[in-house]
């Protein structure tokens, strides 16, 4: 058993049928010595008396808010949560496996640049009685500071019969140098509590590996005289790290017909313009990627040919 | 990525082309190592990220773009003395800092070159003959060093008398390649920045 926060405790259980559970001793936070009784949640049934209460915690029915009273007055509370260990592996019931980029990915994180600011998000089908708290650091043995905000519900989607909820959090490394070569990964830890179930999820990454630039901005077409060709031009996104000559991007320009089956023409360039043939009803799209370190491509910025 | 290879203009900053080749070569070598050594801990998540140049060179700090020198977090630089007469500086008014930057890059390359050559000698003794260093990568390191053209003491290749532990050597190769790729990215960024300056 360990303390999650004041008066909230997590009991770790080896979770299998007929498991013996864990013996837990609760102590009433009071100078009083006698006349103390204990109850669980809203029930008025007295579980025991005395300054301490010993319970055998086996299942969720044994978890909840234990309260010690004296003469009708509440003295203190202890909330017991359960953390299930199923065959040596901590349970992951609360969050959905996003399966991207690999199986067992519960937290996904992205950064728009090298400033040390990043966003993480996760998915759940649970809509109520759910709380999250997020901590982060650079490295784990001698952790350096990363400050995270509160996790917020950022999107709701309908997936088949289920509703899916997306939560996200923004974090900022306290003293980040965009040009630094990372040798210690960022660690992100999310505590999730659903009713009386506790779970924790972690992710470890280097900012350089989670970079995903915003799409190029100001995408424009300039027709070339007496030609089906057009000059496409664009600019670095505002959110990208500066100077651009140091934090350079490379670009992919794509000409896509109306039908998804039509052949796509693609050109790769380090410049912020390209000359392409504009077909009728086609659209031109451009996306960006760090020129020197192949992390994710940005989403496409698009303009119609017409 | 199948990107068209840019060929430098004659007037272009001479080292940019070499640094691009370097990054391409080390990235290819790392990819090959990860595929060949699939049963070894060779991914970014599994290895310890060690920097053999730590406390010996200060490339990131010495090569910091002017725009980032206002960022306090970037200015924890160490004092290191370097030789300052490089041909990449040819016909350019260069500050002392730029000379320091390029000589720091040169020292990095020299240290990695020695490590890679020592390691290759060990790998050649492996009866499994599982992996060797790409000669192209070693040649590209050499070319960039020549382009930088700093006079510096030659570092003797480390020779080892004891029987090599091939498992450890291969893990060390992965660690070295990951670190060198990160340094090659920095070198490429620096060359691109200097070329634009």
């Amino acid at each position: 058993i360990w303390e999650l926060k004041k008066d909230v405790y997590v009991v770790e259980l080896d979770w299998y049928p007929d498991a013996p559970g864990e013996m837990v001793v609760l102590t009433c936070d009071t100078p009083e010595e006698d006349g103390i009784t204990w109850t669980l949640d809203q029930s008025s049934e007295v579980l025991g008396s005395g300054k301490t209460l010993t319970i055998q915690v086996k299942e969720f029915g044994d978890a909840g808010q234990y309260t010690c009273h004296k003469g009708g007055e509440v003295l203190s509370h202890s909330l017991l949560l359960l953390h299930k260990k199923e065959d040596g592996i901590w349970s992951t019931d609360i969050l959905k496996d996003q399966k991207e980029p690999k199986n067992k990915t519960f937290l996904r994180c992205e950064a728009k640049n090298y400033s040390g600011r990043f966003t993480c998000w996760w998915l759940t089908t649970i809509s109520t009685d759910l709380t999250f708290s997020v901590k982060s650091s650079r490295g784990s043995s001698d952790p350096q500071g990363v400050t995270c905000g509160a996790a917020t519900l950022s999107a709701e989607r309908v997936r088949g019969d289920n509703k899916e909820y997306e939560y996200s959090v923004e974090c900022q490394e306290d003293s980040a140098c965009p040009a630094a070569e990372e040798s210690l990964p960022i660690e992100v830890m999310v505590d999730a509590v659903h009713k009386l179930k506790y779970e924790n999820y972690t992710s470890s990454f280097f900012i350089r590996d989670i970079i995903k630039p915003d799409p190029p901005k100001n995408l424009q077409l300039k027709p070339l005289k007496n030609s089906r060709q057009v000059e496409v031009s664009w600019e670095y996104p505002d959110t990208w790290s500066t100077p651009h000559s140091y934090f350079s991007l490379t670009f992919c320009v794509q000409v896509q017909g109306k039908s998804k089956r039509e052949k796509k023409d693609r050109v790769f360039t380090d410049k912020t313009s390209a000359t392409v043939i504009c077909r009728k009803n086609a659209s031109i799209s451009v996306r960006a990627q760090d020129r020197y370190y192949s992390s994710s491509w940005s989403e496409w910025a698009s303009v119609p040919c017409s | 990525r199948n990107l068209p290879v840019a060929t430098p203009d004659p007037g272009m900053f001479p080292c940019l082309h070499h640094s691009q080749n370097l990054l391409r070569a080390v990235s290819n070598m790392l990819q090959k190592a990860r595929q060949t050594l699939e049963f070894y801990p060779c991914t970014s998540e599994e290895i310890d990220h060690e920097d053999i140049t730590k406390d010996k060179t200060s490339t990131v700090e010495a090569c910091l773009p002017l725009e980032l020198t206002k960022n306090e977090s970037c200015l924890n630089s160490r004092e290191t003395s370097f030789i300052t007469n490089g041909s990449c500086l040819a016909s350019r008014k260069t500050s002392f800092m730029m000379a320091l930057c390029l000589s720091s890059i040169y020292e990095d390359l020299k240290m990695y070159q020695v490590e890679f050559k020592t390691m290759n000698a060990k790998l050649l003794m492996d009866p499994k003959r599982q992996i060797f260093l790409d000669q192209n990568m070693l040649a590209v390191i050499d070319e960039l060093m020549q382009a930088l053209n700093f006079n510096s003491e030659t570092v003797p290749q480390k020779s080892s008398l004891e029987e090599p532990d091939f498992y450890k050597t291969k893990i060390k190769l992965c660690i070295l390649l990951h670190a060198f790729r990160i340094r090659a990215v920095t070198i490429d960024r620096v060359m691109s920045y200097l070329n634009a300056s």
Epitope: P17, E59, D87, G88, I89, D93, K104 | P41
Partner: antibody
């Protein structure tokens, strides 16, 4: 004590269907994940499928994906394996088992796919 | 499609020490715990070892398990006639959990 009693096995022709049941008692069935494991005659153990305690997630071996469906009825304390498009290579003893560091197995039920 | 490899058979005389190996990889045994089962002919498997080296109550102490890196082993010190059975190791893979990964199985024969 924990008990898992299996039923539903038998002889079936290739291409036909069969449903296996596993009745649980002696524990809070709705709190635990459950597996199906099979063993072809003279062969080793092969995992078939898993279902979460609440039925929200199901996982299958590639060899049965799209043909077998694992399900549970927590009000009846019963686990099921619906097997469709059966093949000769599905011939095996099928076991249900609880998920956890200490597990409990059903007695096994024989499924024979033969024309 | 077995990822955990065991020797097909091992044998020993009563009282001898018999060991069975179970070889896996970094993504299974390397980062998950190992179980060992004993299966007597015509019966369901019986749990002998969980959590690499833990014995459930009721399992004789002549059975012991260990794990090192990407391999695990089961030792029977002072093997007895009633130990003649098939033995299976089991673990999980990091990417496919909760799918059970079973070993290929080992037939233990007690001679004499």
């Amino acid at each position: 004590q924990v008990q898992l009693v299996q039923s539903g096995g038998g002889v079936v022709q290739p291409g036909r269907s069969l449903r296996l049941s596993c009745a649980a008692s002696g524990f809070t069935f709705s709190s635990y994940g459950m597996h199906w494991v099979r063993q072809a005659p003279g062969k080793g153990l092969e995992w078939v499928a898993f279902i979460r305690y609440d039925g929200s997630n199901k996982y299958y071996a590639d060899s049965v994906k799209g043909r077998f469906t694992i399900s549970r009825d927590n009000s009846k304390n019963t686990l099921y394996l619906q097997m469709k498009s059966l093949r000769a290579e599905d011939t095996a003893v099928y076991y249900c088992k609880t998920h956890g560091s200490h597990d409990n197995w059903g007695q096994g039920t024989m499924v024979t796919v033969s024309s | 499609s077995y990822v955990l490899t065991q020797p097909p058979s091992v044998s020993g005389t009563p009282g001898q020490r018999v060991t069975i190996s179970c070889s896996g990889g970094r993504s299974n045994i390397g980062c998950n715990t190992v179980k060992w089962y004993q299966q007597l002919p015509g019966t369901a498997p019986k749990l002998l070892i969980y959590g690499n080296d833990q014995r459930p109550s009721g399992v004789p102490d002549r059975f012991s398990g260990s794990k090192s890196g990407t391999s695990a082993s089961l030792a029977i010190t002072g093997v007895q006639a009633e130990d003649e059975a098939d033995y299976y190791c089991q673990s999980y893979d990091r990417g496919t959990h909760p799918a059970l990964l079973f070993g290929t199985g080992t037939k233990v024969t007690v001679l004499g």
